[in-house]
Interface confidence: medium
């Protein structure tokens, strides 16, 4: 089981680091988006894991960004963000649709309405229970 956990982490780390860099290879990304969406978590340790990804990193005053699967709908009151940005993408995740759009990446708002827990613990629990 420990070996399985290590292998899983290796896959996840590679997925995070290569996220969005190849539009032709999105299977691992879609799977990880679905994990974040279902387990209500973001990143491996914490959401900041995503800030190492070049295409997601803001510079200076520009906001950092994360995959929209990190968004916690129950913590977001801004209807504009919900209606125009997040809900369309999460509905794709919910239906496990196989289409990717650049808008799958969302800016982190000031109050960071994203899941604040990493997915590691949830995945490890899941592995132990199965």
């Amino acid at each position: 089981r420990a070996q399985l956990e290590r292998s899983l982490r290796d896959v996840v780390e590679k997925t995070i680091q290569k996220y969005g860099t190849n539009p032709e290879e999105t299977a691992a990304e879609e799977s990880w988006d679905y994990v974040q969406f279902q387990l209500r978590c973001c990143g491996w340790h914490y959401p900041q894991d995503w800030f190492q990804v070049l295409i997601l990193r803001g510079n200076g005053s520009e906001a950092h960004r994360v995959p929209c699967s990190c968004y916690n709908l129950s913590a977001t009151n801004d209807s504009t963000i919900l209606d125009k940005v997040i809900l369309p993408q999460l509905s794709r995740l919910g239906h496990l649709a196989r289409s990717r759009h650049s808008a799958d990446i969302c800016a982190v708002p000031a109050e960071s309405h994203i899941y604040r827990e990493g997915c590691a613990q949830g995945l490890q629990k899941w592995l132990h229970n199965n």
Partner: antibody, heavy 117, light 107 residues
Framework: VQLQQSGPELEKPGASVKISCKAS????????MNWVKQNNGKSERLEWI??????????TYNRKFKGKATLTVDKSSSTAYMQLKSLTSEDSAVYYC?????????WGQGTSVTVSS | DIQMTQSPASLSASVGETVTITCRTS??????LAWYQQKQGKSPQLLVS???TLAEGVPSRFSGSGSGTQFSLKISSLQPEDSGSYFC?????????FGGGTELEIK
């Protein structure tokens, strides 16, 4: 971004001390606040004590400091606190607060704590 | 806990030279490694995050590399203001730990 820490403390063995870290220039609840210990003198090694998520108040401690340090926040004043209890000479050090976005990107100026009878 | 072995403990170099500081971790920390600079009596300052990303405002003569268990910080074209202590730190698993530090003296 600024992290302003409280002033130096001189305490007796067995006492407790609470040091503060006031954040400004960013969204306080959007980042974890960490605390780091740095010994004075020859070995200036840095030790991570733990961190707190100001949004929920959740804490993560280095097990070495569990029971020694207690981390809290006051969201209304954007201030983080660390209380150290049952002080001994081993606790004499400079303590830093540091914001983290993964690594610790902004640090306070440090608070010197001296424990002496 | 993950052990951080940083070397050398101290080094002395002249203005314009290039120096490299290395950091070895006892376990795989992926890219979760940061480098800090600390000047006498001051707080540490972030230089490099996620092993190779230069922090805002850090001169391009600093560069980080490595992943897994082997990392290095290279400072090329040394300047007098580069003197001070340098620390590596992982933020991979609890507890985060730091290297023992490298004291850099500019001759």
């Amino acid at each position: 971004v600024q992290l302003q820490q409280s002033g130096p403390e001189l305490e007796k063995p067995g006492a407790s001390v609470k040091i503060s870290c006031k954040a400004s220039g960013y969204s306080f609840t959007g980042y974890n606040m960490n605390w780091v210990k740095q010994n004075n003198g020859k070995s200036e090694r840095l030790e991570w004590i733990g961190n707190i998520d100001p949004y929920y108040g959740g804490t993560t401690y280095n097990r070495k400091f569990k029971g020694k340090a207690t981390l809290t926040v006051d969201k209304s004043s954007s201030t983080a606190y660390m209380q150290l209890k049952s002080l001994t000479s081993e606790d004499s050090a400079v303590y830093y607060c540091a914001r983290s976005v993964g690594p610790m990107d902004y640090w306070g100026q440090g608070t010197s704590v001296t424990v002496s009878s | 806990d993950i052990q951080m072995t940083q070397s050398p403990a101290s080094l002395s170099a002249s203005v314009g030279e290039t120096v490299t500081i290395t950091c070895r971790t006892s376990e795989n920390v992926y890219s979760y490694l940061a480098w800090y600079q600390q000047k006498q009596g001051k707080s540490p300052q972030l230089l490099v995050s996620f092993a190779k990303t230069l922090a805002e405002g850090v001169p391009s003569r600093f560069s980080g590399s490595g992943s897994g268990t082997q990392f290095s910080l290279k400072i090329s074209s040394l300047q007098p203001e580069d003197s001070g202590s340098y620390f590596c730190q992982h933020h991979s698993d609890n507890p985060w730990t730091f290297g023992g530090g490298t004291e850099l003296e500019i001759k």
